[in-house]
């Protein structure tokens, strides 16, 4: 009887080992099929819209990455509360799984838009370097379904790059005017969003817990209208130390107000950045290494 029990245990262990091996093979086969499929989809041109069909529904780009799709491009996602799916650029570099929520690259898109446009999103959702704003509604759906880290990649016209990263990036809903909430900062560009660079200016320069404003919907803390003066939609205070939706100028600029693409702690108020990418990924993202 003891021999029989031991033999049972041995066979169980063998079955478990075989199950593990089969699972590993299945994963490998799946990855190879996906690589093949993605290579077929990638025409290598500027248009990077990747259609995965309705095989499964993804809530963000980290899920797509962890399902084996390693090619950057536009994919369809449907966050938890979202009534419908929408297109978004997935950055599968820099560790992978980043959902790009905003991009500035060349000034081709007008970012001086009203509340509805910023709510629903606008821009170029086809080309790799296309400029866009994903939409406040979509930002809310995304950032309330999980705890996300916001990474902001910044570049100037002198070929320098910096980044700023914030834990627990959250955007409220339409009823609280898409209020911004950010957590702990890390990075090389300086903390322009929370305004921690100088305690004396924090009361008017911080964007933390600010409501979103556009020229036609003013929720800032300023007697005037920040969005109108700065010609963009943003989480304005009185008015800003960061404004990544500002007017596209080529580096240093002069204007009536500091309305360029500004990250104060790197280039001050009177330098407009060359490119910006705002992207999010779950705080505890672990890539599925196959």
């Amino acid at each position: 009887l003891e021999d029989c029990a031991q033999e049972q245990m041995r066979l169980r262990a063998q079955v478990r080992l075989l199950e593990t091996r089969v699972k590993q093979q299945q994963v490998k086969i799946k990855q190879l099929l996906q690589e093949n499929e993605v290579q077929f989809l990638d025409k290598g041109d500027e248009n990077t819209v990747i259609d995965l069909g309705s095989k499964r529904q993804y809530a963000d780009c980290s899920e797509i990455f962890n399902d084996g799709y390693k090619l950057s491009g536009f994919y369809k996602i449907k966050p938890l509360q979202s009534p419908a799916e929408f297109s978004v650029y997935c950055d599968m570099s820099d560790g992978g799984g980043w959902t790009v929520i905003q991009r500035r690259s060349d000034g081709s898109e007008n970012f001086n838009r009203g509340w509805k446009d910023y709510e629903n999103g606008f821009g170029n959702f086809v080309q790799k370097h296309g400029e866009y704003w994903l939409g406040n509604k979509n930002l809310h759906f995304l950032t309330t379904q999980e705890d996300y880290t916001l990474k902001i990649d910044l570049a100037d016209f002198e070929k320098n790059s910096r980044y700023a990263q914030y834990k627990n990036f959250k955007v409220g809903d339409e009823k609280n005017f898409y209020e911004l909430n950010i957590g702990e900062y890390s990075g090389t560009a300086g903390d322009s969003l929370a305004g921690n660079f100088h305690p004396e200016v924090q009361w008017w320069a911080s964007h933390q817990r600010m409501k979103f404003s556009t020229w036609d919907r003013d929720h800032d803390n300023y007697e005037g209208n920040c969005a109108e003066e700065d010609q963009s939609g943003w989480w304005f205070n009185r008015c800003h130390s960061a404004n990544l939706n500002g007017v596209y100028y080529s580096g240093p600029y002069t204007a009536k107000t500091d309305n360029g693409i500004v990250w104060y702690t790197w280039h001050g108020w009177w330098y407009s950045l060359k490119s910006v990418v705002m992207k999010i990924r779950p705080n505890d993202f672990i890539p599925n290494v196959i």
Epitope: R56, Q57, L80, Q81, Q145, E146, E174, K175, N181, P282
Partner: antibody, heavy 116, light 107 residues
Framework: EVQLQQSGPELVKPGASVKISCKAS????????INWVKQKPGQGLEWIGW????????DHNEKFKDKATLTVDTSSSTAYMQLSSLTSEDTAVYFC?????????WGQGTLVTVSA | DIVMTQSQKFMSTSVGDRVSITCKAS??????VAWYQQKPGQSPKLLIY???NRYTGVPDRFTGSGSGTDFTLTISNMQSEDLADYFC?????????FGAGTKLELK
Amino acid sequence: EVQLQQSGPELVKPGASVKISCKASGYTFTDYYINWVKQKPGQGLEWIGWIYPGSGNTDHNEKFKDKATLTVDTSSSTAYMQLSSLTSEDTAVYFCLRFLLRSAYWGQGTLVTVSA
Amino acid sequence: DIVMTQSQKFMSTSVGDRVSITCKASQNVGTAVAWYQQKPGQSPKLLIYSASNRYTGVPDRFTGSGSGTDFTLTISNMQSEDLADYFCQQYSSYPLTFGAGTKLELK
């Protein structure tokens, strides 16, 4: 540590109303949706609705539209559900739930018994 | 609304068994499915999310599989502490919907 602490059991008469509470701790209350779920004795689970504490915005399962009213008190990080015009069909355990893509935190449940 | 059907209300098992609990969605839900374990007088405990991902602290004898409309929760080496009700849930779209549950009992 995320915790949802619900109020104690309730014995109520048919036709009356009851308000049950769910006190959140261990996280920023206003940043996450709170869902409410019903479980009749020995049965499955039914989603009642959600509330977004950041704004008080709500959405309901059509079935519970006239039955459940969801509110929050952000100063005490507490979500409330009021059930009205109670009948024996409302006898159940009611759970509050913070549901994300990769986690789910449930309250311990509140038993509501409707009896004359 | 999406209906989640757990066809087996009860399942008889023995310690050491391999148990498979199935759940069928009335329409494609991708992999937006979670599995819960519930013991009498307790709230449900999350076992599996995204159809196949094990939640933190869940023993590796629990595995989830499936996509689209057909889902399975497998317990590879049944333990006495696994005797409980098991529910599937879809979160592909609101309203969130749950299966009626499958109760595991000892033979």
